[in-house]
């Protein structure tokens, strides 16, 4: 493993990375669930959307989220061409014109209505910690991931490589 500095090293230039092109390279409609198979659901309450983490009843339909994948160039630290590879950034939209946003001050994940171009707070770096699990790292706050806290989505600081595989920041994407 690579210790605390490893996470910081991975993400040190995240906020400097530039998204190449304004259109996504692909889009994917999927349901989002936690590592423990709880569903992420979205409910309209008092003209704003709330995000819940809950067990669904047997035949209850899962909410779908549109994931838009964007390519992002990462500034170089060692390669001669100025770019040290590409990252995948995603935006997550459960319903038209609404996107998940990172509220770094409140350490919360919120649904905001906004127009394109989307703000940086709506972009998350996609990580595969396992072959069938993904994690979402804030573009605006390297080392901070979407996670589950008290049956809600929250922003969780990951300060060591061991914690990158913590179950509460792992999510499953499913087409069903």
């Amino acid at each position: 493993a690579f210790g605390i500095s490893g996470v910081q090293k991975y993400t040190r230039a995240l906020h400097d990375s530039s998204i190449t092109g304004i259109s996504p390279i692909t889009e994917y409609l999927a349901s989002l669930s936690t590592y423990n198979d709880q569903s992420i659901t979205f409910a309209l309450e008092d003209e704003s959307y709330e995000i819940y983490v809950e067990d669904l009843k047997k035949d209850e339909k899962k909410d779908k989220v549109l994931l838009s994948y964007y390519e992002s160039q990462h500034p170089s630290n060692e390669s001669g061409d100025g770019v040290d590879g590409k990252m995948l950034m995603v935006t997550l939209s459960p319903t038209k014109d609404f996107w998940l946003h990172a509220n770094n001050k409140e350490h919360s994940v919120e649904l905001h209505k906004c127009e394109k171009p989307l703000p940086d707070q709506a972009f998350f770096v996609l990580h595969n910690m396992h072959s069938n699990c993904v994690s979402f790292e804030c573009k605006t706050d390297p080392g901070v991931f979407i996670g589950v806290k008290d049956n809600h989505l929250a922003l969780i600081k990951v300060d060591s490589s061991e914690n990158l595989c913590t179950e509460n920041i792992l999510f499953k994407l499913s087409e069903t």
């Epitope: 493993a1 690579f2 490893g6 991975y10 390279i25 692909t26 994917y28 999927a30 994948y69 390519e71 990462h74 630290n77 060692e78 390669s79 040290d84 590879g85 590409k86 990252m87 995948l88 770096v125 996609l126 990580h127 595969n128 910690m129 396992h130 072959s131 069938n132 993904v134 490589s161 990158l164 595989c165 087409e175």
Partner: antibody, heavy 122, light 107 residues
């Protein structure tokens, strides 16, 4: 320039062991998933093993599970494939490959080594 | 496991011809589909990823399309240097699987 250089191939008897190495350079090694792919003489490509960028997860097809072990040493920017209980059907060129993007598996394998030949024969 | 069936297994076409290779998946998946070119004695080369994205440095005569279970690689105008074997590969579900390959020759 991204470079992947495999070594460690050779002739080995059935039941024997071999360790392949892949020396990586030109990129930040510990940001990428790495994968081994093999190709038997005159045949197609077969995925053999993958390891997460953290090194915390490893994946294999049934054909090699329990016999092959993928590992990485980020301090040396080197990928390994330990092959035990080798069989004649493991005879192939073994390629080391790198994922397309930081941190995840999406997007195929844009970088391949030159390959190292493993021959299992008595 | 997702089986990837490529067709045809081989083809012969004239320089300048439009060539189409198909890859049929045994079950649907997201578009994490790549195409590779492999020349004799060489390592494979990534041509297309995300089903339709052209890898840097690959000539624009190569294109990819498709989703779900049906994917296509097209060479709009076959060139002598395109003689090779072409493979599709799905990266959506483990185990990762490749198609059996399509050998392309010049008439």
């Amino acid at each position: 320039e991204v470079q992947l250089v495999e070594s460690g191939g050779g002739l080995v008897q059935p039941g024997g062991s071999l360790r392949l190495s892949c020396a990586a350079s030109g990129f930040t090694f510990n940001n990428y998933w790495m994968t081994w792919v093999r190709q038997a003489p005159g045949k197609g490509l077969e995925w053999i093993a993958s390891i997460t960028y953290t090194g915390g997860g490893t994946y294999y097809p049934d054909s090699v599970k329990g016999r092959f072990t993928i590992s990485r040493d980020d301090s040396k920017s080197t990928l390994y494939l330990q092959m035990n209980s080798l069989r004649a059907e493991d005879t192939a060129v073994y390629y080391c490959t790198r994922a397309n993007y930081y941190y995840n598996t999406y997007g195929g394998f844009p970088y391949w080594g030159q390959g190292t030949l493993v021959t299992v024969s008595s | 496991d997702i089986q990837m069936t490529q067709s045809p297994s081989s083809l012969s076409a004239s320089v300048g011809d439009r060539v189409t290779i198909t890859c049929l998946a045994s079950e649907g998946f997201s578009n994490d589909l790549a195409w590779y070119q492999q020349k004799p004695g060489k390592s494979p080369k990534l041509l297309i990823y995300a089903a339709s994205r052209l890898q840097d440095g690959v000539p624009s005569r190569f294109s990819g399309s498709g989703s779900g279970t049906d994917f296509t690689l097209t060479i709009s105008s076959l060139q002598p240097e395109d003689v090779a074997t072409y493979y599709c590969q799905q990266g959506s579900k483990y185990p990762l699987t490749f198609g059996g390959g399509t050998k392309v020759e010049i008439k």
